[in-house]
C-alpha cells in the first residue's frame, strides 16, 4: 500500500528522487570502468514522516513503533522502490565488455 | 552483491534483525485485529557503515557518495531484505476472517 504523497514538512523535504553527479573517481570505479566517465546517479533522499509513501505494512508498523519508542525504533527510511538499468563499458580479464547493472540507478522511491 | 557481515562499530551495533514486542494498541490495530493480541515484530535496526551488508550496486554507490558528500547524500539504511508472513484474525464486514500478510515481519536485513 503506497500511502500519501503529500509532504507535511514542506515541498521537497520528504522522500523523493534526487540526482547527484558523480565521476568515476568519486565512485571508486576509475580502475575498472571506461564509460561513462560521469554518472548522474539517481537516489532516494528525504524524510519519511508518518505514512508518507509507506511501502508496505511493515513500514506502517515501523511508523507506529517509532512514535512510541523513538530511541529504539528508527523512522522508516527513504529507499528505492525500483531501479533503472545502467550500461557500463568495463575492463575484463580479456579486454573490454558492455555490462548492464539492473540495480544501480533508483527509479522510484518509498519509505520502509 | 551482499558485502561483509563484520561490524566495525562493535557487536550488535550494525544493521541486523531486532525483535520489538508490540500490543495491538501500540500498532493501532485494536479496532480491526482480534488475534494475536501481542506481536513480536521483527525489524531491521542498526548502522550501515561502509559496505556492511550492501544490498546491491546502488548501496555501494551511496556509501561512496556519502563519504564524499555527507550533507547531501545519507548513508545507506538498514531495511528488510525479505519478509516472513504473518496471519491475523481480523474483523470484516461479515464477521471474522484469517488474513495472511506477506510484508509484515522482517526476516533478513541489508543496507540500501
Amino acid at each position: 500500500a503506497r500511502n500519501g504523497d503529500h509532504c507535511p514538512l514542506g515541498p521537497g523535504r520528504c522522500c523523493r528522487l534526487h540526482t547527484v553527479r558523480a565521476s568515476l573517481e568519486d565512485l571508486g570505479w576509475a580502475d575498472w570502468v571506461l564509460s561513462p566517465r560521469e554518472v548522474q546517479v539517481t537516489m532516494c533522499i528525504g524524510a519519511c514522516p508518518s505514512q508518507f509513501r509507506a511501502a508496505n505494512m511493515h513500514a506502517q508498523i515501523k511508523t507506529s513503533l517509532h512514535r512510541l519508542k523513538p530511541d529504539t525504533v528508527p523512522a522508516p527510511c527513504c529507499v528505492p522502490a525500483s531501479y533503472n538499468p545502467m550500461v557500463l563499458i568495463q575492463k575484463t580479464d580479456t579486454g573490454v565488455s558492455l555490462q548492464t547493472y539492473d540495480d544501480l540507478l533508483a527509479k522510484d522511491c518509498h519509505c520502509i | 552483491a551482499r558485502n561483509g557481515d563484520h561490524c566495525p562499530l562493535g557487536p550488535g551495533r550494525c544493521c541486523r534483525l531486532h525483535t520489538v514486542r508490540a500490543s495491538l494498541e501500540d500498532l493501532g490495530w485494536a479496532d480491526w485485529v482480534l488475534s494475536p493480541r501481542e506481536v513480536q515484530v521483527t525489524m531491521c535496526i542498526g548502522a550501515c557503515p561502509s559496505q556492511f551488508r550492501a544490498a546491491n550496486m546502488h548501496a555501494q554507490i551511496k556509501t561512496s557518495l556519502h563519504r564524499l558528500k555527507p550533507d547531501t547524500v545519507p548513508a545507506p539504511c538498514c531495511v528488510p531484505a525479505s519478509y516472513n508472513p504473518m496471519v491475523l484474525i481480523q474483523k470484516t464486514d461479515t464477521g471474522v476472517s484469517l488474513q495472511t500478510y506477506d510484508d509484515l515481519l522482517a526476516k533478513d536485513c541489508h543496507c540500501i
Epitope: R37, V96, S97 | -
Partner: antibody, heavy 121, light 110 residues
C-alpha cells in the same frame, strides 16, 4: 588461430526471415562481446547490435523488434535472427569480436569476411 | 538515438599531404570512438580505438584525437595505400547502449 566465419546468407523474399551464423574459433564467446554490422551495396557501414560475453544484448533503435542476436557458447556460434525482411535489408552482414570502440587484449581487428543477404521477390 | 556525422564526404588529397577527417557525435560519448579504414570487397580495418589509441600494426602516420562530441582522424602524410573510405564508430552508454557509424569519408587522389 582466431577466426570468425559468417554463414546463412542468401536470397529471401520480402517479409521472410533468415538466421545468420557467425562461427568463431580460438576464443570463448563467454569472455568476449560480439558485434554485428551490415553494409548495403555501395553504402556505408551500419551498426546492428552487440551481444556481451554475459549474454546481454544491445541494438540500434532501427533494429529493435525485427533483429535478434543470440549465441550458443557450446557451439562457439553467434546468431543474427532477422524477421520481416525488406528490400532495404539487402546487405553484406559482418560479425566482429569486441565492442570495437575499445580493443580487447590480443588481436585488435577481428572481423569475418561477411555474408550477403539479398531480399527480393 | 546516437547519430555520428562525418565531414567532409569526400576529401581530395595529393600523396604526401596531410588529411584531416572529422566526426561529430550527437551525444557525449567520452572516448567511446573508433576509426576504420575500408577498401572495396574487404571488411573494415581498425585504425584507432578509444578515440586516440593506435591499433596494433597501424602505421604511426595515423592519429586520432578528441573526446565528448568532437573527434578527428589525421593522416600526416598520405601514402598510396591510404586512399580508401574511412568510418568513425561511436558507442553511447547510459540506460542502454547503442552504436552508430558515421556515413564515411572517401579519401581520393587529387
Amino acid at each position: 588461430e582466431v577466426q570468425l566465419l559468417e554463414s546463412g546468407g542468401g536470397l529471401v523474399q520480402p517479409g521472410g526471415s533468415l538466421r545468420l551464423s557467425c562461427a568463431v574459433s580460438g576464443f570463448s564467446l563467454s569472455s568476449y562481446d560480439m558485434t554485428w554490422v551490415r553494409q548495403a551495396p555501395g553504402k556505408g557501414l551500419e551498426w546492428i547490435g552487440i551481444i556481451s560475453g554475459s549474454g546481454n544484448t544491445y541494438y540500434a533503435s532501427w533494429a529493435k523488434g525485427r533483429f535478434t542476436i543470440s549465441k550458443d557458447s557450446s557451439k562457439n556460434t553467434v546468431y543474427l535472427q532477422m524477421n520481416s525482411l525488406r528490400a532495404e535489408d539487402t546487405a553484406v552482414y559482418f560479425c566482429a569480436r569486441g565492442i570495437l570502440v575499445y580493443a580487447d587484449y590480443g588481436d585488435h581487428n577481428l572481423w569475418g569476411q561477411g555474408t550477403l543477404v539479398t531480399v527480393s521477390s | 538515438d546516437i547519430v555520428m556525422t562525418q565531414s567532409p564526404a569526400t576529401l581530395s588529397v595529393s600523396p604526401g599531404e596531410r588529411a584531416t577527417l572529422s566526426c561529430q557525435a550527437s551525444e557525449d560519448i567520452y572516448t567511446n570512438l573508433a576509426w576504420f579504414q575500408q577498401k572495396p570487397g574487404q571488411p573494415p580495418r581498425l585504425l584507432i580505438y578509444a578515440a586516440s589509441t593506435l591499433a596494433s600494426g597501424i602505421p604511426a602516420r595515423f592519429s586520432g584525437s578528441g573526446s565528448g562530441t568532437e573527434f578527428t582522424l589525421t593522416i600526416s602524410s598520405l601514402q598510396s595505400e591510404d586512399f580508401a573510405v574511412y568510418y568513425c564508430l561511436g558507442v553511447y552508454t547510459y540506460i542502454s547502449a547503442e552504436g552508430a557509424f558515421g556515413q564515411g569519408t572517401k579519401v581520393e587522389i587529387k
